[in-house]
């Protein structure tokens, strides 16, 4: 016996109770591929979640996080509280970055400032809680015999850095 279900398009399900007739997905459900024997329940964006895309008969709803939270996990499966720049989220809430560390985003952890001397550089601008150190020229560039001229043009333009 030929499986008639394979003919059922997305947005429908193959209704065994009705001789394998393709029936539309009921309200608040969807099927994103053809040949489905059931429709999946639509995701509901409640609480800290807000709807980014409404559920349709062929695709699930997509959620975002409400203001003050950001998405984590595949398809925004969780919402995590935002902190301010210069902070990180701990079990006790948002805490300022310790001296010598920074976080330039509302999420994630505080990271150590770059140690310019490890890369053979001097410090141009000190770091803050919100921003990394900016390293400057190498000590060799600052010695009495160093040339002041700008080096030859690079092979490519420098990439866009935040301003």
């Amino acid at each position: 016996l030929q499986d008639l279900c394979s003919n059922c398009p997305a947005g429908t399900f193959c209704d065994n109770n009705r001789s394998q007739i393709c029936s539309p997905c009921p309200p608040n459900s969807f099927s994103s591929a053809g040949g489905q024997r059931t429709c999946d329940i639509c995701r509901q964006c409640k609480g800290v979640f807000k709807t980014r895309k409404e559920c349709s008969s062929t695709s699930n709803a997509e959620c975002d996080c409400i203001s003050g939270y950001h998405c984590l996990g595949a398809e925004c499966s969780m919402c995590e509280q935002d902190c301010k720049q210069g902070q990180e989220l701990t079990k006790k809430g948002c805490k300022d970055c310790c001296f010598g560390t920074f976080n330039d985003q509302k999420r994630g952890i505080c990271r150590p400032w770059t140690n310019c001397s490890l890369d053979g550089k001097s410090v141009l601008v000190n770091g803050t809680k919100e921003r990394d150190v900016v390293c400057g020229p190498s000590p060799a560039d600052l010695s009495p015999g160093a040339s002041s001229a700008t080096p030859p043009a690079p092979a490519r333009e420098p990439g866009h850095s935040p301003q």
Partner: nanobody
């Protein structure tokens, strides 16, 4: 590529003021920080003052704190160094410097350090 051109140097008396300018051209959007360095004859080049182009945060060498002020006009792509109460020990060639990456960013084929040609400041007693 970024080009830097200093101006405003000269010969002044101790106690006088001068304002240096550094005009940037080229890929100025990529500059994250700028600074003024100075080099007296036979001495190492030293950082005088620096500034973040975005938020205007500044750093100063102890020897110039309270006398020098670094500032920038992003619309004009120009950085300034206002030098007050000048002393003979401030005599040096002053160089403009620009940096196009946070941390010690380095990528093959990319320049991150740019210097101007320098402007002479001489303070007589």
């Amino acid at each position: 590529q970024v080009q830097l051109q200093e101006s405003g140097g000269g010969l002044v008396q101790a106690g006088d003021s001068l304002r240096l300018s550094c005009a940037a051209s080229g890929s100025t959007f990529s500059i994250v920080a700028m600074g003024w360095y100075r080099q007296a004859p036979g001495k190492q080049r030293e950082l005088v003052a620096s500034i973040i182009t975005g938020d205007g945060d500044t750093n100063y060498a102890d020897s110039v704190k309270g006398r020098f002020t670094i500032s920038r006009d992003n619309a004009k792509n120009t950085m300034y160094l206002q030098m007050n109460s000048l002393k003979p020990e401030d005599t040096a060639v002053y160089y403009c410097y620009a940096r196009t990456g946070y941390g010690s960013s380095w990528l093959m084929g990319h320049e991150y350090d740019y210097w101007g040609q320098g402007t002479q400041v001489t303070v007589s007693s």
